[in-house]
């Protein structure tokens, strides 16, 4: 809290300009009118106020708008946004995508790093949450904006939150946006992607759906195996184990095409390991890869789950 002191003669601010950066904190408090600051917020970001000076400016706005800032002020917060807490932001009503973009831009880290932050900071997460709740769903434009700033944004949402993503928004998702998603998230996103890309032809469809396949069921993998897609091993290793287990050796061979040779290098890792254990050794031998661990010849495989279902 900055104590109240009279403004020195001749220092009263008539407008927000560069001269103010030379004001001490107490002078900013005493000489800058909160209403003037609010009406000239667009100028604040053009002036390199220090982090400590921003404390004073925030304090003035907080006094002027105890119930939360209007969007006309929020839009021009610039670096002042770095001073906002999640509690401050929960008082806001942000409806404009331009406002959201402006604040995300400020928060980009301002380091000359090619690496975008994977997850938003708490105040940014609160801002996004307020914005998305206000819109009612994660529409394509919003998703476009958010994933551009935070490639890992989608994967920071819960499966419940992801359910509000309309299939049309899936077009905005890039493969790298799904890098950190877990199977539960992909389970929600995959059906949306399948719906979004359903009118594409075989090879184009596979290119688009590939990064979502960690949520695909067995029957969809079987269908893909009939389309000469040549799935790479990295994608195969991300498939759900329960979806891979029922696939036959012939189906996996068709699914992977020339990449089938890569199974040897992955034979100790899931889902390949578990899949090998379910296949007849005779069938595995037909691949000529030296995969071991299949069911020996002459053994009978009982599908207990089927038996339970019948009883």
């Amino acid at each position: 809290e900055v104590e109240k002191t009279a403004c020195p003669s001749g220092k009263k601010a008539r407008e927000i300009d560069e001269s103010l950066i030379f004001y001490k904190k107490w002078e900013l408090e005493a000489c800058v009118d909160a209403a003037l600051l609010a009406t000239q917020m667009d100028r604040v970001n053009a002036i390199p106020f220090t982090y400590e000076q921003l404390d004073v400016l925030k304090h003035k706005l907080d006094e002027l708008y105890p119930q939360g800032y209007p969007e006309s002020v929020i839009q021009h917060l610039g670096y002042l946004f770095l001073k906002m807490s999640p509690e401050d932001i929960r008082k806001w009503n942000v409806t404009s995508l331009e406002t959201l973009k402006a604040l995300l831009e400020v928060n980009k880290g301002h380091e000359m790093s090619p690496q975008a932050p994977r997850r938003p900071l708490p105040q940014v997460a609160t801002l996004i949450d307020r914005f998305v709740k206000g819109r009612g769903q994660l529409d394509k434009d919003t998703l476009d904006t958010l994933t551009a700033f935070y490639p890992g944004y989608l994967c920071s949402l819960s499966p419940e939150e992801l359910s509000s993503v309309p299939p049309s928004s899936i077009w905005a998702v890039r493969p790298q946006d799904l890098d950190t998603c877990d199977p539960r998230q992909l389970d929600v996103l995959y059906p949306k992607a399948r719906l979004a890309f359903q009118n594409m032809n075989g090879s184009e469809y596979f290119v688009k759906i590939q990064s979502f396949l960690g949520g695909a069921p067995t029957e969809d993998l079987k269908a893909l195996s009939q389309q000469n897609v040549s799935m790479d091993l990295a994608t195969f290793m991300k498939l759900r184990t329960d979806a891979v287990l029922p696939l036959t050796v012939a189906e996996v061979q068709k699914l992977l095409g020339p990449h089938v040779e890569g199974l040897k290098a992955e034979e100790r890792h899931r889902p390949v390991r578990d899949w090998i254990l379910r296949q007849r050794q005779d069938d595995l031998d037909t691949l000529g890869l030296g995969l071991q661990g299949g069911i020996p010849n002459g053994y009978l495989v009982l599908d207990l789950s089927m038996q339970e279902a019948l009883s």
Epitope: K24, T50, E52, L82
Partner: antibody, heavy 120, light 107 residues
Framework: QVQLQQSGAELVKPGASLKLSCKAS????????MHWVRQAPGQGLEWIGA????????IYYQKFKSRFTITVDKSTSTAYMQLSSLTSEDTAVYYC?????????????WGQGTTVTVSS | DIVMTQSSSFMSASVGDRVSITCKAS??????LAWYQQKPGQSPKLLIY???TRQTGVPDRFSGSGSGTDFTLTISSVQSEDVATYFC?????????FGQGTKLEIK
């Protein structure tokens, strides 16, 4: 990577004027404030002023405001500082430097410096 | 203006020694303080900011501490390549001001 390439050493007479240059590369020139700092022989560092290339907004330390002028040429990503009415007190190495986050004005990247000698 | 004072203009140490360089501000600057290293014939290089945050790529033998008016840069085990002049800078308010520098030499 970020580079700030400054013009070569200068020897001038008292009362003369001089224009120093600083060519930036490896980043978006219009995104960051460009500052100038000087260092007299065997002395500490002294902040002079800065310019934002996008808006042409400038700020100066009061003691330099009347004699030093900072400008930019966006088309060549170059910042300039014009020095006038030079005296022997202005003999120093002049550095350009950029600050990535203006609210945290630490000098993230520096030019190699231009040596200015004012002598009759 | 905030005046930054580095009481020692010169320090001497042996390789492996622990060295502390101090800096005092004439007014409270919180933790808005940076440290720079300037090797002979080179430009300054940012080492520490926010009084104690190491810049990316700076060896962990360098550390900073302090807040308010009193600050310290510590080199836990001096190496021969640490021969340089070290400056502090406050960025709490404009004009930005620096200390006069402390020159470190190896015995």
């Amino acid at each position: 990577q970020v580079q700030l390439q400054q013009s070569g050493a200068e020897l001038v007479k008292p009362g003369a004027s001089l224009k120093l240059s600083c060519k930036a590369s490896g980043y978006t020139f219009t995104s960051y404030w460009m500052h100038w700092v000087r260092q007299a022989p065997g002395q500490g560092l002294e902040w002079i002023g800065a310019i934002h290339p996008n808006s042409d907004n400038t700020i100066y330390y009061q003691k330099f405001k009347s004699r030093f002028t900072i400008t930019v040429d966006k088309s060549t990503s170059t910042a300039y500082m014009q020095l006038s009415s030079l005296t022997s007190e202005d003999t120093a190495v002049y550095y350009c430097a950029i600050i990535i986050t203006p609210v945290v004005p630490k000098f993230d990247y520096w030019g190699q410096g231009t040596t200015v000698t004012v002598s009759s | 203006d905030i005046v930054m004072t580095q009481s020692s203009s010169f320090m001497s140490a042996s390789v492996g020694d622990r060295v502390s360089i101090t800096c005092k501000a004439s007014h409270d600057v919180g933790t808005s303080l940076a440290w720079y290293q300037q090797k002979p014939g080179q430009s300054p290089k940012l080492l520490i900011y926010w009084a104690s945050t190491r810049q990316t790529g700076v060896p962990d033998r360098f550390s900073g501490s302090g807040s308010g008016t009193d600050f310290t840069l510590t080199i836990s085990s001096v190496q021969s390549e640490d021969v340089a002049t070290y400056f502090c800078q406050q960025y709490s308010s404009y004009p930005l001001t620096f200390g006069q520098g402390t020159k470190l030499e190896i015995k």
